[in-house]
């Protein structure tokens, strides 16, 4: 993989420790928390990033209506278990032996249980809806300009193949970005939509994961786009399994 050879850093992940101890003295970077080697030419998996974050010291168009099965990450931060490829393990447990099943983006998709809970497979999140609300601007954004700018962003900054940006919807002041990626569509080397969405979310929050970058500030044809709030909905290939108690809460 490529890390900046001169000063040996990881351009795509600041939550790493890098040293020239790779083959032939090449720069090798390992994720904080897990110590796993990361590929600095692409995005690091969300599981490794969450683990690193937990180890770090504290510091006219109709919009899409999320389906009834859409998940929102309400549980927040936890220290996840990652598999050898850096993916989330299907079952996650905390220190008090409370366990739950997660999807491929690490969001809980079942009720919490005990150590006897079984999660047979890691269910893939194949559809992500990023819902943004922007602050007042000089005027409404031109939809095609906004669409082009957001597609460019996901292609250039997050290295996500354009075919995975399914749509950009706009009804001032709401912007929705739809990412879709089925298991069958994702080829080796393709950035995962869950990882791209996580990098985007952190960028919007002013917590860029890229080395030496501040937060992401978007502009469309020169016009500053100041985001007021962000909501991300996750849709899995298999609907989540929650008890009726949760659904009626």
């Amino acid at each position: 993989h490529t890390a900046a050879q001169d000063n040996c850093t990881c351009p795509t992940n600041k939550m790493t420790v890098c040293s020239p101890d790779g083959p032939g003295g090449r720069c090798q970077c390992r994720a904080l928390g897990s110590g796993m080697a990361v590929d600095c030419s692409t995005l690091t998996s969300k599981c490794l990033l969450l683990k690193a974050r937990m180890s770090a010291p504290k510091n006219a168009r109709t919009l899409v209506r999320p389906s009834e099965h859409a998940l929102v990450d309400n549980d927040g931060l936890y220290d996840p278990d990652c598999d050898p490829e850096g993916r989330f393990k299907a079952r996650q447990c905390n220190q008090t032996s409370v366990c739950w099943c997660v999807n491929s983006v690490g969001v809980r998709r079942t009720d919490k249980g005990d150590l006897s809970l079984r999660c047979d497979e890691l269910v893939r999140t194949h559809h992500i809806l990023i819902d943004l609300r922007h602050r007042p601007t000089a005027g409404a954004f031109n939809h095609s300009d906004l669409d082009a700018e957001l597609r460019r962003l996901f292609r250039e900054r997050y290295r996500l193949h354009p075919k995975f940006v399914a749509a950009v919807h706009y009804e001032q002041p709401t912007i929705q970005i739809e990412l879709r990626q089925n298991t069958s569509q994702k080829a080796a080397g393709d950035v995962d939509i869950g990882d791209a969405a996580y990098y985007f979310e952190r960028d919007i929050k002013g917590e860029s994961l890229f080395q030496g970058r501040g937060g992401l500030d978007l502009r469309v044809r020169g016009e500053p786009l100041q985001v007021e709030r962000t909501l991300i909905y996750y849709l899995d290939e298999i609907p989540p399994k929650f008890s009726m108690k949760r659904l009626t809460a």
Epitope: G214, R221, Q226
Partner: antibody, heavy 119, light 106 residues
Framework: QVQLVQSGAEVKKPGASVKMSCKAS????????IHWVRQAPGQRLEWIGY????????KYNEKFKGRATLTSDKSASTAYMELSSLRSEDTAVYYC????????????WGQGTLVTVSS | DIQMTQSPSSLSASVGDRVTITCKAS??????LAWYQQKPGKAPKLLLY???SLETGVPSRFSGSGSGTDYTLTISSLQPEDFATYYC????????FGQGTKVEIK
Amino acid sequence: QVQLVQSGAEVKKPGASVKMSCKASGYTFTTYVIHWVRQAPGQRLEWIGYINPNNDGTKYNEKFKGRATLTSDKSASTAYMELSSLRSEDTAVYYCARPHFETHAMDYWGQGTLVTVSS
Amino acid sequence: DIQMTQSPSSLSASVGDRVTITCKASEDIFNRLAWYQQKPGKAPKLLLYGATSLETGVPSRFSGSGSGTDYTLTISSLQPEDFATYYCQQYWNTWTFGQGTKVEIK
């Protein structure tokens, strides 16, 4: 290199209007908005508003709505600010500024136009 | 509007001193914070953006930290050319500046 060159100092009477200019060079004028910021003697910097030369769209600080008018001339790569109904507290240095290429912070600034309002 | 409160409003220091200026926002600004240096009769100069990112050409003795509502500008070893007024600015919701901190020679 990027440059913002502002018009010269002005002395005005209360109730009058003043119009100042900001000529941009060294970059594509329509790529960025132009902000206007003022600084009264011994006071903090105060954002007035911005104009997007692409479409002449404007956004103002509520405090200046109705009194400040921002315009631009693409062919001359120049932005203008007019402030009407001047009062003594409008005595200040008025700056134009361009955003940073990566963020909404202000990277390049004009040298400032001093406006003195006095009877 | 988001209010920005800087402290102290002025400080006296000597060459070589470590100087810290703080800026508090009235609400979370998600690291959309810039620091500027201004010398008398001159326009402000951008030092840092995104709370921690150093603008090109700015000496590494300047650094920024913070998150949420609380941010800090640190000059690790004050140089003669650093005596000036420093302003913080938020750009999360429109643009507002702090009242400034004047760094004077002791």
